[in-house]
């Protein structure tokens, strides 16, 4: 009697599962008790001796290419072995990569995490990933795993942190980069400073005052509020950082607490109050203020 | 005293278009900016669109976004909101109110039906 | 997006009773936030901000509460006209600038 080894498929594609079947064509597997065991090279495979004449492989491997057979064994011990049939297992090339954030957009707050998921649409096998900052490219970390995905993480995003990244997969066909991706790091606003400026030492009624507030800290645009005892003056804004100014023109009303505060959308922020005062000087018929 | 007045409201069919304006008074409207709120009926206060004193920046909610423009003319005191695309969802009463940062004074409303 | 939850959704009261209204916040609003309060057929109007600061004109009777993500209106004593629908909203990250979705005052 003649046994034969068929693999289904026969060319098969990394990942994929192999079914393995030891054919008689001559003999009824059940005309006899047989056992039945299968080989790479070698090594018996799976659970060694089985009365099943099919081994199935949940998935072939690059590295499970090679020479596969099997024996078959009567209950009188009399082995019959297949011939040899060749198992080349097709590595697919990764293609299509990509770099996504999470949060999504590559806008994210300092102090947040921050993860680069680097993606292929196809390829098979240990995929290598590497990611890499600036479009120069120095390299953060590299991962090899056999996934379509692999993640790069930084726990606490820094303002340094804000760059254009990429990320590179191969599976010895070749690196494969992916587009950049920019990443922008939003900063909340700092506790903002409220300086009174006047066109002198003692500003005199009728005098413009300008109250300038700013947060050196914060991504712009920045929204600042101006206050005189709680009641709000207006708003300003820098739309490229740094502060802005509000002018008043002065009345004797205008004398008491000033503050400011600002906010960029990530968080307001109220400076210290600033007192301005009226002083007569004497001799003086017009009121002063002085802060 | 400081008021504000909203006007524009009306019946409207899906997919159509309305205009809605705030009109400001008692105070320097350049100064502040300006924020459109709509309660749906029964529901409760959904923030819609904002924009800043000079009109540099403007916000969005959402479910609006691509759909309605809020816009300013500092020189008439008046706010406005463009609604393109209108839907059922969409209708509500919507406030206009002013922002100091909080919103300290609204309008009255304008009711903004939207049915076929 | 700091999403607001208010509780209870309604109080049952009767005048001259103590009202307490709590707002939770999804993450820190520090002391940026606002209570407003609403009639039937009438517009918001600002009660509370920055926490606990009076709005020109609110009777002292109520007063606010809290910072960070845990914030309560109390009302001393209810009077006829305190009947209402209340809403805290923050301001302290935008956009959006959020509402919770309420808490109505009734008459026991």
């Known amino acids: 009697a003649e046994l034969f080894l068929i693999a289904s498929p026969s060319h098969p594609t990394e990942g994929s599962p192999v079914t393995l079947t030891c054919k008689m064509p001559f003999l009824q597997s059940s005309d006899a008790q047989f056992q039945f065991c299968f080989f790479r090279d070698t090594r018996a495979l799976g659970p060694g001796w089985s009365s099943s004449p099919k081994l199935q492989i949940a998935a072939m491997w690059k590295e499970d290419t090679g020479s596969y057979w099997c024996e078959a064994q009567t209950m009188a011990s009399k082995v019959l072995r297949s011939r040899r049939s060749q198992i080349n297992v097709h590595r697919v090339p990764v293609a299509d990569v990509s770099l996504e954030t999470q949060p999504p957009g590559g806008q994210v707050m300092e102090g947040d995490r921050l993860v680069l998921i680097c993606s292929v649409a196809m390829g098979t096998g240990d995929i290598t990933f590497l990611w890499y900052k600036g479009a120069v490219g120095l390299n953060l970390q590299s991962k090899t795993q056999r996934s379509l995905t692999a993640e790069y993480e930084i726990p606490s995003v820094r303002e340094s942190d804000a760059e254009q990244y990429y990320c590179v997969a191969e599976n010895g066909y070749g690196p494969s980069p992916s587009g950049l991706v920019s990443i922008t790091v939003r900063i909340p606003v700092s506790r903002p400073i409220l300086m009174l400026r006047a066109p002198r030492a003692q500003a005199a009624v009728e005098d413009v005052l300008e109250l300038h507030c700013e947060a050196l800290r914060g991504s712009p645009p920045i929204l600042y509020w101006f206050y005189h005892e709680d009641i709000t003056l207006g708003s300003r804004s820098a739309p490229s950082g740094g502060g802005a100014s509000f002018n008043l023109s002065l009345t004797e009303e205008h004398s008491g607490n000033y503050s400011c505060e600002a906010n960029n959308g990530l968080g307001a922020q109220r400076s210290e109050a600033v007192t301005l005062n009226f002083t007569v000087p004497t001799g003086a018929r017009s009121n002063h203020l002085t802060s | 005293q400081v008021q504000v007045v909203e006007s524009g409201g009306g019946v409207v069919q899906p997919g159509r278009s309305l205009r809605l304006s705030c009109a400001a008074s008692?105070?320097?409207?350049?100064?502040?900016?300006m924020h459109w709120v709509r309660q749906a009926p029964g529901k409760g206060l959904e923030w819609v669109a904002g924009?800043?004193?000079?009109?540099?920046?403007?916000y969005y909610a959402d479910s609006v976004k691509g759909r309605f423009t809020i816009s300013r003319d500092n020189s008439k005191n008046t706010l406005y909101l463009q609604m393109n695309s209108l839907r059922a969802e969409d209708t509500a009463v919507y406030y206009c109110?002013?922002?100091?940062?909080?919103?300290?004074?609204w309008g009255q409303g304008t009711l903004v039906t939207v049915s076929s | 997006e700091i999403v607001l939850t208010q509780s209870p959704a309604t109080l049952s009261l009767s005048p001259g009773e103590r009202a307490t209204l709590s707002c939770r916040a999804s993450?820190?609003?520090?002391?940026?936030l606002a209570w407003y309060q609403q009639k039937p057929g009438q517009a918001p109007r600002l009660l509370i901000y920055?926490?606990?600061n009076r709005a020109t004109g609110i009777p002292a009777r109520f007063s606010g509460s809290g910072s960070g993500t845990d914030f309560t209106l109390t009302i001393s004593s209810l009077e006829p006209e305190d009947f209402a629908v209340y809403y805290c909203?923050?301001?302290?990250?935008?956009?959006?600038?959020?509402f919770g979705q309420g808490t109505k005052v009734e008459i026991k």
């Open positions: 109110a002013r922002e100091s940062p909080n919103f300290d004074y």
């Open positions: 008692g105070f320097t409207f350049s100064n502040y900016g």
């Open positions: 924009i800043w004193y000079d009109g540099s920046n403007k």
């Open positions: 993450q820190s609003v520090s002391s940026y």
């Open positions: 920055d926490a606990s």
């Open positions: 909203q923050q301001r302290n990250n935008w956009p959006p600038w959020t």
